[in-house]
């Protein structure tokens, strides 16, 4: 199908709707597939909801935006900025993001075009 | 050699139409976006419009839509540009360059650059 | 006025640095990767940056680039005479679906 596009909506907007999901689960998900079962990370309960579980409860609040497609970047930066000063070295870091950027695909979401995930100002 | 070659461009009078061409030869334009930037004289680069090579995405800047119309044929390696509606803000040197876009987790930029064409409008 | 703010001209003396800041907003720098030209007088633009940090090949070590939130930088050490030209940013903006240039700085090697 051609699509033209016009303009996609304020990013202002996408700020409103990532403040009003919940993105607990969707960085609980990562850092249990980056962590495995491990126990050094122990900010969460990790051992108390399965993996699974968890990306499920991820995709149902991404869903949970209006207009999930549009804001999925707005999203993904969040998590990054929330989780970036739990990561304790670059490698972790490389991981995350890249279990990160695997997201929308597991979700069944079409990876956001454009998307600069360095957004923590060189923290990460 | 990868090079993009434009053509079309020349003199024409307020409200008319031109047809720009971009021509590539050393690479496959079909994976690549494509793009349109314009320069008026002693100005600055200004992006025009994009378009994905199989035509299922095109932006345009907000001053030019409805007026300018980007596409592709992939059969010929070409992009065209067809401008109607001309005035004198669209007095300009014509690039196209190859988009280094990707699907996703990238930004667009520019590594191939056209010579340029000239546009000129005036009565 | 281009959306994407540059100041119109920086100098630098031969072999010293300089930086070429590009300010932008959340909707373009702040979300999106900033792409950074080189135009010599009477030429083509050419790429010098990518995705914020990457270079092409071809382009030198001296010339790197950053961004934090929302400005970009490009630093070009060791000033030579052949980088006199017009530099300029550019960015994809998420609100108005189109791609920025910022006004261009042009750089003098002193």
């Known amino acids: 199908m051609r699509r033209e596009r016009g303009r996609q909506g304020d990013s202002s907007s996408c700020e409103r709707q990532v403040d009003r999901v919940n993105l607990k689960p969707c960085e609980q998900h990562i850092m249990q597939r980056i962590m495995g079962e491990q126990e050094q990370y122990d900010s969460y309960d990790i051992r108390s909801t399965r993996s699974s579980d968890q990306q499920q409860r991820c995709c149902d609040e991404l869903n949970e935006m209006e207009n999930t497609q549009r804001c999925m970047c707005e999203a993904l930066q969040q998590i990054m900025e929330n989780q970036c000063d739990r990561l304790q070295d670059r490698q972790m870091v490389q991981q995350f993001k890249r279990e990160l950027m695997n997201l929308p695909q597991q979700c069944n979401f079409r990876a956001p075009q454009r998307c600069d995930l360095d957004v923590s100002g060189g923290r990460c | 050699q990868k090079q993009l070659v434009e053509s079309g461009g020349g003199l024409d009078q307020p409200a008319g139409s031109l047809k720009l061409s971009c021509k590539d030869s050393g690479f496959t334009l079909s994976t690549f976006y494509m793009t349109w930037v314009h320069q008026a004289p002693g100005k600055g680069l200004e992006w025009i419009a994009n378009?994905?090579?199989?035509?299922?995405?095109?932006d345009y800047l907000d001053s030019v839509r409805g007026r300018f119309t980007i596409s592709s044929d992939n059969t010929q390696n070409m992009v065209d540009l067809e401008m109607n509606s001309l005035t004198a803000a669209d007095m300009a040197i014509y690039f196209c360059?190859?988009?280094?876009?990707?699907?996703?987790?990238?930004?667009?930029?520019?590594?191939?650059w056209g010579q340029g064409t000239l546009v000129t409008v005036s009565s | 006025q281009p959306a994407l703010t540059q100041p119109s001209s920086v100098s630098g003396a031969l072999g010293g640095s300089v930086t070429i800041t590009c300010s932008g907003t959340g909707s373009n720098i702040g979300h999106n990767y900033v792409s950074w030209y080189q135009q010599l007088p009477g030429s083509v633009p050419k790429l010098l940056m990518f995705d914020n940090t990457k270079r092409p090949s071809g382009i030198p070590e001296r010339f790197s680039g950053s961004k934090s939130g929302t400005t970009a930088s490009l630093t070009i050490s060791g000033l030579q005479p052949e980088d006199e030209a017009d530099y300029y940013c550019?960015?994809?903006?998420?609100?108005?679906?189109?791609?920025?240039f910022g006004g261009g700085t042009k750089l003098t090697v002193l």
């Open positions: 550019a960015t994809w903006d998420a609100d108005l679906s189109a791609v920025l």
């Open positions: 378009i994905k090579q199989d035509g299922s995405e095109k």
């Open positions: 360059a190859r988009n280094g876009l990707q699907d996703s987790y990238s930004g667009d930029f520019f590594d191939h």
